[in-house]
């Protein structure tokens, strides 16, 4: 058993049918010695008397808010949450496996640049009685500061019969140098509590591996005289790290017909312009990627050919 | 990623082309190592990230873009100790900081070259003959060093008398390649920045 926060405790249980559970001793936070009684949640049934209460915690029915009283007055509370260990592996019931970029990915994180700011998000089908708390650091043995905000509900989607909820959090490394070569990964830890169930999820990454630039901005077409060709031009996104000559991007220009089956023409360039043939009803899209470290491509910025 | 390779103009900063080749070569070598050594801990998540140049060179600090010198987090360990001249610099542009930067890059390359050559000698003794260093990568390191053209003491190749532990050598190869790829990215960024200046 360990303390999650004041008066909230997590009991770790080896979770299998007929498991013996864990013996827990609760102590009433009071100078009083006599006439103390204990109850669980809203029940008025007295579970025991005395300054301490010993309970055997086996299932969720044994968890909850234990309260010690004296003469009708509440003295203190202890909330017990359960953390299930199933065959040596901590349960992951609360969050959905996003399966990207690999199985057992519960937290996904992205950064728009090298400033040390990043966003993480996760999915759940649970809509109520759910709280999250997020901590982060650079490295784990001698952790350096990363400040995270509060997790907020950022999207709701309908997936088949289920509703899916997306939560996200923004974090900022306290003293980040965009040009630094990372040798210690960022660690992100999310505590999730649903009703009386506690779970924790972690992710470890280097900022360089989660970079995903914003799409190029100001995408424009300039027809070339007496030709089906057009000059496409664009600019670096505002959110990208500067100077651009140091944090350079490479670009992919795509000409896509109306039908998804039509052959796509693709050109790669380090410049912020390209000459392509504009077909009728086609659209031109451009996306960006760090020129020197192949992390994710940005989303496409698109304009119609007409 | 198959991108069109830009060939530099004669007047262009001479090292840019070499640094692009270096990044391409080390990235290919790392990919090859990860595939060949699939049963070894060779992914970025699994290895310890060590920097053999730590406390010996200060490339990131010495080569910091002017725009980032206002960022206090980038100036924590700005210890620069190299004062030499290199042929990559157009003589008019030769500046103290640029010389320090290029000299630091040269020292990095020299250190990695020694490590890789020592390691290759060990890998050649492996009865499994599982993996060797790409000669193209070693040649590209050499080319960039020649283009930088700094006069520096030659570092003797380390020789080891004890029987090599091939498992450890292969893991060390992975660690070295990951670190060298990160340094090659920095070198490429620096060359691109200097070329634009």
């Amino acid at each position: 058993i360990w303390e999650l926060k004041k008066d909230v405790y997590v009991v770790e249980l080896d979770w299998y049918p007929d498991a013996p559970g864990e013996m827990v001793v609760l102590t009433c936070d009071t100078p009083e010695e006599d006439g103390i009684t204990w109850t669980l949640d809203q029940s008025s049934e007295v579970l025991g008397s005395g300054k301490t209460l010993t309970i055997q915690v086996k299932e969720f029915g044994d968890a909850g808010q234990y309260t010690c009283h004296k003469g009708g007055e509440v003295l203190s509370h202890s909330l017990l949450l359960l953390h299930k260990k199933e065959d040596g592996i901590w349960s992951t019931d609360i969050l959905k496996d996003q399966k990207e970029p690999k199985n057992k990915t519960f937290l996904r994180c992205e950064a728009k640049n090298y400033s040390g700011r990043f966003t993480c998000w996760w999915l759940t089908t649970i809509s109520t009685d759910l709280t999250f708390s997020v901590k982060s650091s650079r490295g784990s043995s001698d952790p350096q500061g990363v400040t995270c905000g509060a997790a907020t509900l950022s999207a709701e989607r309908v997936r088949g019969d289920n509703k899916e909820y997306e939560y996200s959090v923004e974090c900022q490394e306290d003293s980040a140098c965009p040009a630094a070569e990372e040798s210690l990964p960022i660690e992100v830890m999310v505590d999730a509590v649903h009703k009386l169930k506690y779970e924790n999820y972690t992710s470890s990454f280097f900022i360089r591996d989660i970079i995903k630039p914003d799409p190029p901005k100001n995408l424009q077409l300039k027809p070339l005289k007496n030709s089906r060709q057009v000059e496409v031009s664009w600019e670096y996104p505002d959110t990208w790290s500067t100077p651009h000559s140091y944090f350079s991007l490479t670009f992919c220009v795509q000409v896509q017909g109306k039908s998804k089956r039509e052959k796509k023409d693709r050109v790669f360039t380090d410049k912020t312009s390209a000459t392509v043939i504009c077909r009728k009803n086609a659209s031109i899209s451009v996306r960006a990627q760090d020129r020197y470290y192949s992390s994710s491509w940005s989303e496409w910025a698109s304009v119609p050919c007409s | 990623r198959n991108l069109p390779v830009a060939t530099p103009d004669p007047g262009m900063f001479p090292c840019l082309h070499h640094s692009q080749n270096l990044l391409r070569a080390v990235s290919n070598m790392l990919q090859k190592a990860r595939q060949t050594l699939e049963f070894y801990p060779c992914t970025s998540e699994e290895i310890d990230h060590e920097d053999i140049t730590k406390d010996k060179t200060s490339t990131v600090e010495a080569c910091l873009p002017l725009e980032l010198t206002k960022n206090e987090s980038c100036l924590n360990s700005r210890e620069t100790s190299f004062i030499t001249n290199g042929s990559c610099l157009a003589s008019r542009k030769t500046s103290f900081m640029m010389a320090l930067c290029l000299s630091s890059i040269y020292e990095d390359l020299k250190m990695y070259q020694v490590e890789f050559k020592t390691m290759n000698a060990k890998l050649l003794m492996d009865p499994k003959r599982q993996i060797f260093l790409d000669q193209n990568m070693l040649a590209v390191i050499d080319e960039l060093m020649q283009a930088l053209n700094f006069n520096s003491e030659t570092v003797p190749q380390k020789s080891s008398l004890e029987e090599p532990d091939f498992y450890k050598t292969k893991i060390k190869l992975c660690i070295l390649l990951h670190a060298f790829r990160i340094r090659a990215v920095t070198i490429d960024r620096v060359m691109s920045y200097l070329n634009a200046s």
Partner: antibody, heavy 115, light 112 residues
Framework: QVQLVQSGGGVVQPGRSLRLSCAAS????????MHWVRQAPGKGLEWVAF????????YYADSVKGRFTISRDNSKNTLYLQMKSLRAEDTAVYYC????????WGQGTMVTVSS | SYVLTQPPSVSGTPGQRVTISCSGG????????VKWYQQLPGTAPKLLIY???QRPSGVPDRFSGSKSGTSASLAITGVQAEDEADYYC????????????FGTGTKLTVLG
């Protein structure tokens, strides 16, 4: 004490269907994940499928994906395995089993797919 | 599709020490705990070892388990005639959990 009693096995022709049941008693069935494991005659153990305690997630071995469906009725304390498009290679003893460091197995039920 | 490899058979005379190995990889045994089962002919498997080296109550202490790196082993000290059975190791793969990964199985023959 924990008990898992299986039923539903038998002889079936290739291409036909069969539903296995596993009735649980002696524990809070709705709190635990459950597996199906099979063993072809003279062969080793092969995992077939898993279902979470609340039925929200199901996982299958590639060899049965799209043909077998694992389900549970927590109000009846029963686990099911619906098997469709049966093949000769599905012939095996099928076991249900609880998920956890200490597990309990059903007695097994024989499924024979033969024409 | 077995990823955990066991020797097909091992044998020993009563009183001898017998070990059965189970070889896997970094993503399974290297990252997860190992269980060992004993299966007597015509019966369901019985749990012998969980959590690499833990014995459930009721399992004789002549059975012991261990794990090192990407391999695990089951040792039976002072093997007895009633130990003649099939033995299976089981673990998980970090990418496919909760799918159970079973070993290929080992037939233990007690001679004499």
């Amino acid at each position: 004490q924990v008990q898992l009693v299986q039923s539903g096995g038998g002889v079936v022709q290739p291409g036909r269907s069969l539903r296995l049941s596993c009735a649980a008693s002696g524990f809070t069935f709705s709190s635990y994940g459950m597996h199906w494991v099979r063993q072809a005659p003279g062969k080793g153990l092969e995992w077939v499928a898993f279902i979470r305690y609340d039925g929200s997630n199901k996982y299958y071995a590639d060899s049965v994906k799209g043909r077998f469906t694992i389900s549970r009725d927590n109000s009846k304390n029963t686990l099911y395995l619906q098997m469709k498009s049966l093949r000769a290679e599905d012939t095996a003893v099928y076991y249900c089993k609880t998920h956890g460091s200490h597990d309990n197995w059903g007695q097994g039920t024989m499924v024979t797919v033969s024409s | 599709s077995y990823v955990l490899t066991q020797p097909p058979s091992v044998s020993g005379t009563p009183g001898q020490r017998v070990t059965i190995s189970c070889s896997g990889g970094r993503s399974n045994i290297g990252s997860n705990t190992v269980k060992w089962y004993q299966q007597l002919p015509g019966t369901a498997p019985k749990l012998l070892i969980y959590g690499n080296d833990q014995r459930p109550s009721g399992v004789p202490d002549r059975f012991s388990g261990s794990k090192s790196g990407t391999s695990a082993s089951l040792a039976i000290t002072g093997v007895q005639a009633e130990d003649e059975a099939d033995y299976y190791c089981q673990s998980y793969d970090r990418g496919t959990h909760p799918a159970l990964l079973f070993g290929t199985g080992t037939k233990l023959t007690v001679l004499g």
